[in-house]
């Protein structure tokens, strides 16, 4: 719980508590923003990001965004609040311990995004289909 000597200031989103009043600690995430990547046609990739950050706010989770266009491939690693959209998409899988990439529709590029809530979980990004059984099209393929 928040000890009495730690003041909970007005509109303070740096102190996040659960229903029992226990103070939630911040996530530890890879945080290199956007970097060029060689990750392509693989089941999983490491981020090759050497920066692990303490997320600024305890409600933030780890996020990775993989993008491929005609010119290059980039991988973005950040902390982000799952209550807010990122790149115009909701972070549906924010509570997952693993960063399971899901494709999103973006014109002119291939765009995958994942989010997760365990230490440095956006360091290992997973494209492998065996993890993506929540995809209805994939379930059709599996059961045919």
């Amino acid at each position: 719980t928040i000890p009495p000597h730690v003041q909970k200031s007005v509109n303070n989103d740096m102190i996040v508590t659960d229903n029992n009043g226990a103070v939630k600690f911040p996530q530890l995430c890879k945080f290199c923003d956007v970097r060029f990547s060689t990750c392509d046609n693989q089941k999983s990739c490491m981020s090759n990001c050497s920066i692990t950050s303490i997320c600024e706010k305890p409600q933030e989770v780890c996020v990775a965004v993989w993008r491929k266009n005609d010119e290059n491939i980039t991988l973005e690693t950040v902390c982000h609040d799952p209550k807010l959209p990122y790149h115009d998409f909701i972070l549906e899988d924010a509570a997952s311990p693993k960063c399971i990439m899901k494709e999103k529709k973006k014109p002119g590029e291939t765009f995958f995004m994942c989010s997760c809530s365990s230490d440095e979980c956006n360091d290992n990004i997973i494209f492998s289909e065996e993890y993506n059984t929540s995809n209805p099209d994939l379930l059709l393929v599996i059961f045919q």
Partner: nanobody, 119 residues
């Protein structure tokens, strides 16, 4: 009973250094991830640094990276925060905290030690 007792705070000039200590007792210190947090007057709690239980991997907030160093001495059950190149904005009450076994919440805090950076 779990206890965390911070010490080492005080008044220091900008550019100066301080070393904070947190004496821990009542739990298996070397099995706990430990954190330093701070709270400036009228501001929210800011998570400053963490140190892992295994391998002593360290983590820092961007605001203190390159200036602060967290360390621990498991034989003395003590957590440290070496603060160099101190700035006025580092003025705050500094708390050490033990991460709970659930790995989801803080369950024990120290009473805090005040660091004032002023000329």
């Amino acid at each position: 009973e779990v206890q965390l007792l911070e010490s080492g705070g005080g008044l220091v000039q900008p550019g100066g250094s301080l070393r904070l200590s947190c004496a821990a007792s009542g739990f298996t210190f070397d099995a706990a991830r430990m954190w330093w947090a701070r709270q400036a007057p009228g501001k929210g709690l800011e998570w400053v640094s963490a140190i892992a239980d295994i391998g002593n991997t360290t983590y820092y907030a961007d605001s203190v990276k390159g200036r602060f160093t967290i360390s621990r001495d498991n034989s003395k059950n003590t957590l440290y925060l070496q603060m160099n190149s101190l700035r006025a904005e580092d003025t705050a009450v500094y708390y050490c905290a033990k991460q709970s076994g659930s790995e989801d919440h803080f369950d024990y805090w120290g009473q805090g030690t005040l660091v004032t950076v002023s000329s």
